[in-house]
């Protein structure tokens, strides 16, 4: 009778992460008597995947009933495959021995490759807000994909950006990879409603590329412009002075009126009006009793916006 051969018919198998891998193995004879074991890798450091005789292997099931006396099919299924399962798997026949079974013959091996989807890209912007005309950096990260080939694009409001740097790690062979990209974006006053999008395309994606977004409303600070004007006299000895605070973002704003350098009133922006571009306008007014002043009055509208140093605008009120 011909000597037993261990046949692994598949040189290579490709499986999607999360799916089940079937590793086929048959023996050409029932003799010698002894169990089959599956290993990943060869040599002394090989990893035991399945032992017919003993042990607990929750992810492994056999294709055939190995308890049947005439069974020669030793194929296995490994469930919930991850990129970490990639490698070469060997089906090894042992001969019954005492005290230990002795390795008799190995199959040629089946290389298991795993394809894994990239995680949803996460876009993060700068920690502090920045003002228009400044350049800010956004980062995009996606992890866990295989194979290594991946494309990443940046967009601002649908327009592709070109000023970015991308790295895929690790540089060498690995079971899975990560991508990290940094894009530079120049802010404009109209960017409150703008979005920065990071788009990742990979062979495993059946839909459109995966997208991560960041709203520039979380990044931009548009400082206000101030205008102080004197309204016609409302009543005898009373003058109405208004401070127009225009085109600011975010809303957080505190206004202080000063009369000749002395604090007259402080208020917080509440009933603001929103512009089409997402910025806000607000108006504060001060009623000045002219008869209380002998000399001309210097009225100052001082605005502290979003925790920044105060900006101010003054108006000289003539007392005739």
């Amino acid at each position: 009778e011909e000597e037993l051969q261990v046949i692994q018919p598949d040189k290579s198998v490709l499986v999607a992460a999360g799916e089940t891998a079937t590793l086929r193995c048959t023996a050409t004879s029932l003799i010698p008597v002894g169990p089959i074991q599956w290993f990943r890798g060869a040599g002394p450091g090989r990893e035991l995947i399945y032992n017919q005789k003993e042990g607990h292997f929750p992810r492994v099931t056999t294709v055939s009933d190995l308890t049947k006396r005439n069974n020669m099919d030793f194929s296995i299924r490994i469930g919930n495959i991850t990129p970490a399962d990639a490698g070469t798997y060997y089906c090894v026949k042992f001969r019954k021995g005492s005290p230990d079974d002795v390795e008799f013959k190995s199959g040629a091996g089946t290389e298991l490759s795993v394809r894994a989807k990239p995680s949803a890209p996460v876009v993060s912007g700068p920690a502090a807000r920045a003002t228009p005309q400044h350049t800010v950096s956004f980062t995009c990260e996606s992890h866990g994909f295989s194979p290594r080939d991946i494309t990443l694009k940046w967009f601002k409001n649908g327009n592709e950006l070109s000023d970015f740097q991308t790295n895929v790690d690790p540089v060498g062979e690995s079971v899975s990879y990560s991508i990290h990209s940094t894009a530079k974006v120049v802010l404009t006053r109209e960017d409150v409603h703008s979005q920065v999008i990071c788009e990742v395309a990979h062979v495993t994606l059946q839909g459109d590329p995966l997208r991560g977004t960041a709203n520039l409303s979380e990044t931009i600070r548009v400082p206000p412009t101030l205008e102080v004007t004197q309204q016609p006299v409302r009543a005898e000895n009373q003058v109405n002075v208004t401070c127009q605070v225009r085109k600011f973002y975010p809303q957080r704003l505190q206004l202080t009126w000063l009369e000749n350098g002395n604090v007259s009133r402080t208020e917080t922006a509440s009933t603001v009006t929103e512009n089409k571009d997402g910025t806000y306008n607000w108006m504060s007014w001060l009623l000045v009793n002219v008869s209380a002043h002998r000399d001309d009055v210097k009225l100052t509208c001082q605005v502290e916006h979003d925790g920044q140093p105060a900006v101010s605008k003054s108006h000289d009120l003539k007392v005739s």
Partner: antibody, heavy 116, light 109 residues
């Protein structure tokens, strides 16, 4: 799992024609689908794909000559203004479950003849 | 666009022969290459995907190898049902576009 193309016929140059690919055994919302063609005695040529979410992508030579769309069970290829060079058998195909780099299921094809 | 050059364009062989068809890409496509078999009046049938993986139900006499720009389809022992035209097809992960080789017709000697 099956794909069947329909709508192929003799059409005059410039007359729009829509081909359909009817699928069964799987959901169009889970796979990328593609259109290909083969002129008599020639090789296979890629026309375009439609993603699982419904976005079409075209070969660089298409330049608006074709439009790909889909419903829940059919994928369509509209020939916007056919010329005699568009005479071919048109195939629809589905990409493999492991990735969009290969097509594992093909329809039998439908013949379009463009002639005056 | 990537060009795929298949060779030979046709070959004559006998049953039992070992047949090799090559496909060259004009730029690297890594391992994103598939091989199809097509018989007259029929749709293409997938044989090999990702350069070297045998598609389910395809006889083991078919094998694929290569990566980067050079790829090979081998039929270890030609069978009567293997007389057909074979196409390679690439996918480019940057342009996300597909290109076919011009085909290799395998005829009976």
């Amino acid at each position: 799992v099956q794909l069947v193309e329909s709508g192929g016929r003799l059409v005059q140059p410039g007359t729009p024609l829509t081909l359909s690919c009817t699928v069964s055994g799987f959901s169009l919302s889970s796979y990328v689908m593609g259109w290909f063609r083969q002129a008599p005695g020639k090789g296979l040529e890629y026309i375009g794909i439609i993603s699982s979410s419904g976005s079409p992508y075209y070969a660089s030579w298409v330049n608006g000559r074709f439009t790909i769309s889909k419903t829940s069970t059919t994928m369509d290829l509209k020939m916007n203004s056919p010329t005699t060079e568009d005479t071919a058998t048109y195939f629809c195909a589905r990409v493999g479950p492991l990735g969009v780099d290969y097509f594992n299921i093909w329809g039998p094809g439908t013949l379009v003849t463009v002639s005056s | 666009d990537i060009q795929m050059t298949q060779s030979p364009s046709s070959l004559s062989a006998s049953v039992g022969d070992r047949v090799t068809i090559t496909c060259r890409a004009s730029q690297s496509i890594n391992s994103y290459l598939a091989w199809y078999q097509q018989k007259p009046g029929k749709a293409p049938k997938l044989l090999i995907y990702s350069a070297s993986f045998l598609y389910s139900g395809v006889p083991s006499r078919f094998s694929g190898s290569g990566s980067g720009t050079d790829f090979t389809l081998t039929i270890s022992s030609l069978q009567p049902e293997d007389f057909a035209t074979y196409y390679c097809q690439s996918w480019h992960y940057i342009s996300r576009s597909y290109t076919f080789g011009q085909g290799t017709k395998v005829e009976i000697k």
